[in-house]
């Protein structure tokens, strides 16, 4: 056997080159046939009336033919024949690659609630061979499952991703990325997640700055509530008691002037949105006012004791469960 060919892989619409090569030529006739065994070229003559076939080279050692604007119907075995005694035959297989026609991503719901599992579908239409679909949430790769449909040698792949969403996923892109031998570079489509979540509540003591509350002083607490949608209502209540009459409520702020021991207790900031509600507690303890010492008439030794108050914040934004901010005296 001294007749050789090579298999050809070509992208739809591009040019395929078929080469019939002869080692140790003896000027025998070379012929190229299509998969239906119709003669494309006999020497340098083309009986087949398909002008997409063009002669690139003809000699006693090679018949080289180009096929332009390749379509999927051109796929198959092409036969090289050499009219020696006995005749020789070799075949080359043309494989046509078709990139996906369309890439579509579809999210089950435009807006999801934290903790929900949503289904995201990505469909790569009419490719050959079947497309491999990869999923990413931001930079993290996730695993989807694919269904593959074939019709007329073309494959439509639908990959389904089940995604449990968290509040941190809000605004993060879900990316459907295609891997296919006919696609160079990065073919992908994406949708941004919109995740609704219940408020997170934080209490900040804006006055006094050092965190020690004494009789006669003022107290100012600010409640920060962040959620999606943004909480419309932020309310202050005193747990197990009435709010002091001299307390002033202004939006997220709570002012208590001229503190006294009867103000001791737990003050709660509550916030809610359509997803749920959450709260944070501040435990107020009012200390005695500083004692004033008269100027000494004799020399004395004074020992000063410093009391430090450390603010410990314990926040739990799970709806309906207890959480607290406590001022702990050490």
């Amino acid at each position: 056997q001294n007749l050789f060919t090579k298999d050809v892989t070509v992208i739809e619409g591009e040019v395929a080159t078929i080469s019939c090569q002869v080692n140790k030529s003896d000027d025998s006739v070379i012929q190229l046939l299509n998969p239906n065994r119709q003669t494309i070229y006999f020497r340098d003559f083309r009986p087949l009336k398909d002008s997409r076939f063009q002669l690139l080279n003809f000699s006693s050692s090679e018949l080289k033919v180009s096929l332009t604007n390749v379509s999927i119907s051109d796929e198959g075995r092409y036969f090289c024949q050499l009219y020696t005694d006995p005749p020789q035959e070799s075949y080359t297989t043309i494989t046509v690659l078709v990139p996906p026609r369309n890439l579509m991503i579809d999210i089950q719901r435009d807006t999801a609630v934290e903790g929900e599992e949503i289904e995201v579908n990505c469909t790569a239409m009419a490719s050959k061979p079947a497309t491999t679909i990869r999923w990413f949430k931001g930079n993290t790769e996730l695993k989807g499952k694919s269904e593959v449909e074939e019709w007329s040698d073309m494959y439509t792949v639908t990959s389904q991703l089940m995604l449990k969403v968290h509040k941190e996923d809000d605004g993060v892109p879900v990316i459907c990325q295609v891997e296919h031998p006919a696609v160079t570079g990065n073919l992908q489509t994406q949708r941004y997640l919109e995740v609704q979540y219940k408020p997170q509540v934080h209490i900040q003591m804006t006055y006094p700055l050092q965190g020690l509350t004494r009789e006669g002083d003022a107290l100012e607490l600010t409640c920060e509530a962040i959620g999606k949608p943004q909480p419309v209502m932020v309310t202050w209540v005193r747990v197990d008691d009435e709010m002091p009459q001299h307390a002033v409520l202004s939006g997220p702020n709570l002012f208590i002037n001229n503190l006294n021991k009867t103000d001791n207790g737990t003050y709660r900031c509550e916030a809610s949105n359509i997803v749920g509600k959450a709260h944070s507690d501040y435990m107020l303890y009012v200390y005695d006012p500083p004692t004033t010492i008269p100027p000494p008439t004799t020399t004395t030794t004074t020992t000063t004791t410093t009391t430090t108050t450390i603010l410990t914040i314990i926040t739990d934004s799970r709806a309906g469960e207890e959480g607290s901010i406590r001022a702990v005296d050490h």
Partner: antibody
């Protein structure tokens, strides 16, 4: 109504050859991949080979690669399986099936027995 | 590995629910299909894709999938459901097909 009818099975000696045919009707044959699946007596199903609608792409299980050749004639709505170098463990009922993994239609099968 | 693993035999009381499972690496990427085969007959496709039933298949048959495991559930098993059940899928390369070893379902 989709119909698949296999033929060509029979008794053959080890090392021998056999050609199975599957006549298809009731659907656009050239638009669908086709497959062969076999089942040894008392055993499970084993995928053998598949071919694309145009016949341009063929796929084989490792156990038959190089010995079996799948082909089709879309003008005759017929699928073929050429089996060479047959072995005793190729003994099975051979089914032809529509498409190449979700086998939505099956023939009734043809029995191939490889024995001395 | 490109293998699918099934329990060889499962039994169910008439009218009860039974689940047949299929495990394999390829099921992380592809959905399984399920086939019912009665003695002396060709297999019949009962579930494919995420949970699709071909026409004529009763709605007591359903499919589900998680990780590397696919399940076929028959809710309210009937006497005529007694058969061998096979799962299959594309293998991880996407070019070959793999079958499970089959599960013999007995309806008591």
């Amino acid at each position: 109504e989709v119909q698949l009818v296999e033929s060509g099975g029979g008794l053959v000696q080890p090392g021998g050859s056999l050609r199975l045919s599957c006549a298809a009707s009731g659907f656009t044959f050239s638009s669908y991949a086709m497959s062969w699946v076999r089942q040894a007596p008392g055993k499970g199903l084993e995928w053998v080979s598949a071919i694309s609608g145009s016949g341009g792409s063929t796929y084989y299980a490792d156990s038959v690669k190089g010995r079996f050749t799948i082909s089709r004639d879309n003008s005759k709505n017929t699928l073929y399986l050429q089996m060479n170098s047959l072995r005793a463990k190729d003994t099975a009922v051979y089914y032809c099936a529509k498409t190449n993994w979700n086998f939505d239609y099956w023939g009734q099968g043809t029995l191939v027995t490889v024995s001395r | 590995s490109s293998e699918l693993t099934q329990d060889p035999a499962v039994s169910v009381a008439l009218g009860q629910t039974v689940r047949i499972t299929c495990q394999g690496d390829s099921l992380r990427s592809y959905y399984a299909s399920w086939y019912q085969q009665k003695p002396g007959q060709a297999p019949v496709l009962v579930i494919y894709g995420k949970n699709n039933r071909p026409s004529g298949i009763p709605d007591r048959f359903s499919g589900s999938s998680s990780g590397n495991t696919a399940s076929l559930t028959i809710t309210g098993a009937q006497a005529e459901d007694e058969a061998d059940y096979y799962c299959n899928s594309r293998d991880s390369s996407g070019n070959h097909v793999v079958f499970g070893g089959g599960t013999k379902l007995t309806v008591l």
